[in-house]
């Protein structure tokens, strides 16, 4: 088969994927060293032609029909260090006619995903391996793990076995693999985990399968260096007890069934019944343990989509370094964090999605805070000062709550209502659908605000000074969807504003820019505006990029300011061929197809055009 | 020298077919990969179809697909391509062409072309 | 397919200046850290002749003159100085990804 395809070559790398081979190239330069021939038609790998190829190091055969592999096909590449089979038929028994793979005596890495094998299998196919740091075995058929498994491979490092069927790994099964680091078993049948032993691990991720329990080896000596674990996506009960692994920096432990015990522990020596509740807690550490305090280093905790009603005080206890702790979808009515030095490097805060009525936040607690989530909750009645508390606080999401804003200093508002004036440090805020019936004057004095979203709360009364002290900063300020009739806010003075959003009011009229200001975008879709005159609009012509008018009732004649931005001013205004206006016989025409004379007819002169 | 002639070229109707020949001199024609390009009246240039070495493989572009075929005879030094079901977006002139000695797509030797004209 | 767009459509340089042809590519043309991007020059009346490979290699036979540049999507061909033996259409074609295209070309006259 001295046929020659149009491969790429670049000094000693060949690429001939998709090339719809069917034998491997016989005519490549013989010094080649990396070499693709994923995405062909290969359907046997013999030793000739293959064994010309003496200097390769990378061989990807991916994605090819391969069903046969001559016995010794690879001896002769005693460079090759990575070698990919992934995507063909190796399940297919004339795969293993005679020692599988053979011996790999240089290769680091080796992807043999995506081949529908089974357990048996592939201790036939797997020969000695001793340089082997990554293997993939990866959406194969593997139901379970022996400790004859893995043997001949005492340097394998990193471990993939997602998207398989493993419902039993065998005592032992990685006990050959004295080097393991990172281990991928998600996407199986796994039920428990009841003896995790694995101390050089480092990396585990159990995501996707369906767990109840995960529990350590007890043996106090024990140094696990596991520092990231995800069991998102089982069936956890209970918080597992991970007293033992000191060193965790990321848990995932989001889309189970857990719930947090809502009394004390019976007893205080770490591991409880886990009809208790408390499987455990990490209250306290085995005696042993490095650091004496589980959890101390953990710097990311999702706890989202579980069944969670209370946190107790001694769960957050522990948790002195965690930046983000995500409790986002759990069934949550309160929550607390008021001791001094609580959660003192939390970051982000995601409580969004719970039943919250009460949040107690002290008042040097969560002094890192600078995300607060607290989206589609029942929040109503917080002390005045929750949010002035938080010292570090950027962004503020109460979207969907029932808080009621109170006014500024001079104007403190009604009981129950919660101060957002002088919060120096937060810059966006999101009080969405809250039912706010008011906003009183001041009431973001001295918070230098740059998005400020108002949107959603029907009948709103903007009070004249409400948005007083947001002129220098306010860039993105949206007020959808409240009905409003007149707009009490000087609008032109907000020199910074960048995007307003006054879409699905009953505006008619907006102040004047008569000076050039920053504003970019402004929507102003189902609206009652007839008229967008030069005079009102011209401030915002060196600025303004988009303009959203749909739904509004267009006069056709005297919005020659409107009419000029559609034929060739810089404003990209939305649907212009949708854009439609009413001549005074209420004919509904298209704006952009009207002229000037069709105004002269009655009289009507476009003042603007 | 490197020479390629184009022959076979001419009128035909919509559905009709016509076959394309190259000879090829002056290179060892068997060692190379060949392709044939047009050139539409708009002068845009198409790839059109290509041929491994030996005759064993043959790539195309869908808009081609079932309806051009390419075809190479090493002892006679000749490639060819049969093109059936025509249609007017056919019309182009067609040109052979010599791919680098390493098998890329990159042509460097092209013939003068001849003329394909689709029309009822 | 990856398209590859041309511009200027047409240009007009005086002899001896310098001319600056551009292709831009829907996606990336590099592998192995090489671009697959090859340009081609067709005089009235003759077929396409190749005159940089790879991006930035000269064909043998062809004057210094002619350059090429760019990497993954942006590649440019410099003709320095002109002379009036360039006049032609220059085509930029990709051999990265099947199918191979061509770009639509850019017309040299002279000033």
């Known amino acids: 088969h001295q046929d020659k395809v149009p491969c790429k070559m670049v000094d000693k790398k060949v690429s001939c994927q998709v090339l719809g081979l069917l034998q491997v190239p016989s005519v490549l330069p013989p010094d080649t060293e990396t070499l693709d021939l994923s995405g062909n038609q290969l359907r046997s790998i013999l030793a000739s032609p293959l064994g010309f190829y003496t200097a390769l190091r990378h061989l990807d055969l991916s994605t090819n029909e391969i069903s046969f592999l001559q016995p010794g096909a690879f001896q002769a590449l005693t460079h090759l260090e990575h070698l990919s089979l992934a995507h063909n038929r190796l399940a297919m028994a004339t795969a293993l006619s005679a020692g599988g793979l053979g011996p790999l005596p240089r290769v680091t890495s080796l992807d043999l995903s995506g081949n529908s094998l089974y357990s048996g299998l592939l201790e036939r196919l797997l020969g000695e391996a001793p340089s082997l740091h990554t293997l993939s075995l990866a959406e194969n058929s593997l139901t379970r793990l022996t400790r004859h498994t893995f043997r001949d491979m005492p340097a394998l490092e990193q471990l993939d076995l997602h998207s398989n069927v493993l419902m039993d790994i065998e005592d032992g099964a990685f006990e050959g693999l004295p080097r393991l680091t990172h281990l991928n078993l998600s996407r199986n049948s796994l039920t428990c985990i009841s003896d995790f032993s694995l101390q050089q691990l480092r990396v585990l991720d159990l995501s996707c399968n369906s767990i109840e329990a995960f529990q350590t080896a007890s043996q106090p000596q024990a140094e696990f260096q596991l520092t990231w674990l995800d069991l998102r996506e089982n069936k956890l009960l209970h918080f597992p007890d991970l007293a033992a692994l000191p060193r965790l920096i990321y848990l995932n432990l989001s889309n189970n069934l857990i719930r947090l015990p809502t009394g004390p522990p019976q007893d205080s020596k770490g591991i409880h019944a886990p009809s208790e509740g408390w499987s455990a807690l990490p209250l306290s550490a085995p005696s042993g343990n490095a650091s004496g305090r589980p959890l101390s280093q953990l710097l990311n905790l999702d706890l989202s989509y579980n069944e969670i009603e209370l946190i107790p005080d001694s769960f957050l206890e522990h948790l002195t370094s965690l930046c983000f702790l995500n409790l986002s979808r759990n069934c949550l009515r309160t929550f607390e964090a008021r001791r001094l030095g609580s959660l003192p490097c939390l970051m982000l805060l995601d409580l969004s999605h719970n039943a919250l009525e009460t949040l107690e936040l002290g008042a040097r607690a969560l002094g890192s805070l600078r995300t607060l989530l607290l989206q589609g909750n029942a929040l109503r009645d917080l002390p005045p000062y929750t949010f002035a508390n938080l010292a570090s606080l950027q962004r503020l999401n109460l979207q969907g709550n029932r808080v009621s804003p109170c006014g500024g200093p001079d104007e403190p508002g009604p009981s129950g209502c919660v101060a957002f004036s002088g919060i120096t440090s937060l810059r966006s805020l999101s009080l969405v659908d809250n039912e706010i019936e008011l906003l009183r004057a001041g009431a973001f004095l001295h918070t230098p605000l740059t998005e400020l979203d108002l949107s959603s709360n029907p009948g709103l009364e903007v009070a004249t000074g409400a948005l007083g002290g947001l002129e220098a900063s306010l860039e993105v300020l949206a007020l959808q969807g409240n009905g409003l009739m007149v707009l009490q806010v000087d609008l032109p003075c907000f020199i910074c504003l960048k995007r307003l959003n006054l879409a699905e009011n009953r505006l008619s009229h907006l102040p004047a820019w008569t000076q050039a200001v920053s504003l970019e975008v402004l929507d102003l879709r189902n609206n009652s505006f007839s008229l967008l005159p030069g005079s009102a609009m011209g401030g915002l012509e060196t600025s303004l990029r988009r303009l959203y008018l749909q739904g509004n009732p267009l006069s056709c004649c005297g919005n020659g300011w409107l009419a000029a931005q559609l034929h060739q001013g810089r404003v990209d205004v939305d649907a212009t061929q949708d854009l439609i206006c009413r001549f005074s016989s209420q004919e509904e025409v298209s704006l952009s197809h009207v002229r000037p004379e069709d105004c002269e007819k009655g009289g009507l002169k476009n003042i603007n055009l | 020298e490197v020479k390629l002639v184009e022959s076979g070229g001419g009128s035909v109707k919509p559905g009709g077919s016509l076959k394309l020949s190259c000879a090829a001199s002056g290179f060892t024609f068997s060692n190379y990969v060949m392709s044939w390009v047009r050139q539409t009246p708009e002068k845009r240039l198409e790839w059109v179809a290509t041929?491994?070495?030996?005759?064993?493989?043959?790539y195309y572009p869908d808009s081609v697909k079932g309806r051009l075929t390419i075809s190479r005879d090493n002892a006679k030094n000749t490639l060819y391509l049969q093109m059936s079901s025509l249609r007017s977006e056919d019309t182009a002139m067609y040109y052979c062409?010599?791919?680098?000695?390493?098998?890329?797509?990159?042509?460097?030797?092209w013939g003068q072309g001849t003329s394909v004209t689709v029309s009822s | 397919d990856i398209v590859l767009t041309q511009s200027p459509a047409s240009l007009a340089v005086s002899l001896g200046q310098r001319a600056t042809i551009s292709c831009r590519a829907s996606?990336?043309?590099?592998?192995?850290?090489?671009?697959?991007m090859h340009w081609y020059q067709q005089i009235p009346g003759q077929p396409p002749k190749v005159l940089i490979y790879r991006a930035s290699n000269l064909e043998s036979g062809i004057p210094a003159r002619f350059s090429g540049s760019g990497s993954r999507t942006d590649f440019t061909l410099t003709i320095n100085p002109v002379e009036a033996g360039d006049v032609a259409t220059y085509y930029c074609q990709q051999t990265n990804e099947h199918p191979p295209t061509f770009g639509g070309g850019t017309k040299l006259e002279i000033k």
């Open positions: 041929i491994s070495s030996g005759g064993s493989y043959t």
């Open positions: 996606e990336s043309v590099d592998t192995y850290g090489n671009s697959f």
């Open positions: 062409a010599r791919g680098y000695d390493n098998g890329d797509y990159v042509m460097d030797y």
